[in-house]
Amino acid sequence: VEVQVSEDPVVALVDTDATLRCSFSPEPGFSLAQLNLIWQLTDTKQLVHSFTEGRDQGSAYSNRTALFPDLLVQGNASLRLQRVRVTDEGSYTCFVSIQDFDSAAVSLQVAAPYSKPSMTLEPNKDLRPGNMVTITCSSYQGYPEAEVFWKDGQGVPLTGNVTTSQMANERGLFDVHSVLRVVLGANGTYSCLVRNPVLQQDAHGSVTITGQPLTF
């Protein structure tokens, strides 16, 4: 028996369902009573789901997995993972045993888009050219860790005096806070771009300082 899985990682958004594809080629006369199917975490061998003795043995993994029972006899051993969490990320091995056996691993990459950044300024009044200001760009509930880029109004990257921190919450999602310290010119626009490297999703925020008032 030869097991086939997707070469590319499966990308799944947090709280959505994901399908980890796995297939095998049944011989003529194959019956489900002959099938021994195991899905397990590759790195720990923790059992996720199994089908043996002609019966779906069910989920051994937080009751969020399911097979496609009507398709098994055709060689479809794919696994449905419901309500994906950050902690589900990793490699899953599909192991098929009939007379002989084979296995293959598929990677699950979890992602969550970042919110539109909010911009804050400190100090936020009585600003004069030459003043040092701190601009904070905050974006929330994304995964995996973001890449943060700052630019001025002319699109020139600002790399000096940037401090970025990323903190995971109890669900494993990241809140990003990036701080730019800059000396004000006569006027100027400062924009922050928060990029999710897996989704290739960019979230933009900007602040324009034109004497008074400020625009966000």
């Epitope: 790195d43 059992l47 199994s50 043996t52 003795e53 043995q57 007379q99 002989d100």
Partner: antibody, heavy 118, light 109 residues
Framework: EVQLLESGGSLVQPGGSLRLSCAAS????????MSWVRQAPGKGLEWVSG????????YYADSVKGRFTISRDNSKNTLYLQMNSLRAEDTAVYYC???????????WGQGTTVTVSS | QSVLTQPPSASGTPGQRVTISCSGS????????VNWYQQLPGTAPKLLIS??QRPSGVPDRFSGSKSGTSASLAITGLQSEDEADYYC???????????FGGGTKLTVL
């Protein structure tokens, strides 16, 4: 040729420590889980410990938990078993075995003898 | 007491067929590969059969089968050099441990 060669076994007093090594050759060591299995004189085979290919996951038999530590150095193609607080009942031939993707210990070393006695 | 249950001994005359049984549970043999090892006196165990698959170099006189939570090893055309200890083993995903049978001593009469 695929080979596993254990070393480090010796006579040690109860309460003492010992580190066993297993040198692997002839295969991509870093791609395989590995195990230690022991056999007391005149007795059957008893699994001791296992470790994932990267070393991130480790498992132990209840009889050695908290006393033995399995580790590996993939750059040296070597598996280790650090044995502390040794007891007379740890006296055995210790084998290292390759543990493949199909849950088969398919290659075994020739074994190294550990004797715990005062 | 072993998690997998094997008879302690078995015997047969040259040319005969003998079988050795191994009984386990749903968390080991029931869904995991069952392996059979031959250990000749004074030597390391050698893999003989996995489920019903023989590694290259193992004579086809040896065969394995598995049904439910039990497995068996059959040896046909018994030879004197088959006199050895035979062990079944499987990964147990409830215990997170390898489990072995107690071993069966095969005597060729």
């Amino acid at each position: 040729e695929v080979q596993l060669l254990e070393s480090g076994g010796s006579l040690v007093q109860p309460g003492g420590s010992l580190r066993l090594s297993c040198a692997a050759s002839g295969f991509t060591f870093s791609s395989y889980w590995m195990s230690w299995v022991r056999q007391a004189p005149g007795k059957g085979l008893e699994w001791v410990s296992g470790i994932s290919s990267s070393g991130s996951a480790t498992y132990y038999a209840d009889s050695v938990k908290g006393r033995f530590t399995i580790s590996r150095d993939n750059s040296k193609n070597t598996l280790y078993l650090q044995m502390n607080s040794l007891r007379a009942e740890d006296t055995a031939v210790y084998y290292c075995a390759r543990w493949n993707d199909y849950d088969i210990m398919d290659v075994w070393g020739q074994g190294t003898t550990v004797t715990v006695s005062s | 007491q072993s998690v997998l249950t094997q008879p302690p001994s078995a015997s047969g005359t040259p040319g005969q067929r003998v079988t050795i049984s191994c009984s386990g549970s749903s968390s080991n043999i029931g869904r995991r590969t069952v392996n059979w090892y031959q250990q000749l006196p004074g030597t390391a165990p050698k893999l003989l059969i996995s489920n019903s698959q023989r590694p290259s170099g193992v004579p086809d006189r040896f065969s394995g089968s598995k049904s439910g939570t039990s497995a068996s090893l059959a040896i046909t055309g018994l030879q004197s050099e088959d006199e050895a200890d035979y062990y079944c083993a499987s990964w147990d995903d409830s215990l997170n441990a390898w489990v072995f049978g107690g071993g069966t001593k095969l005597t060729v009469l």
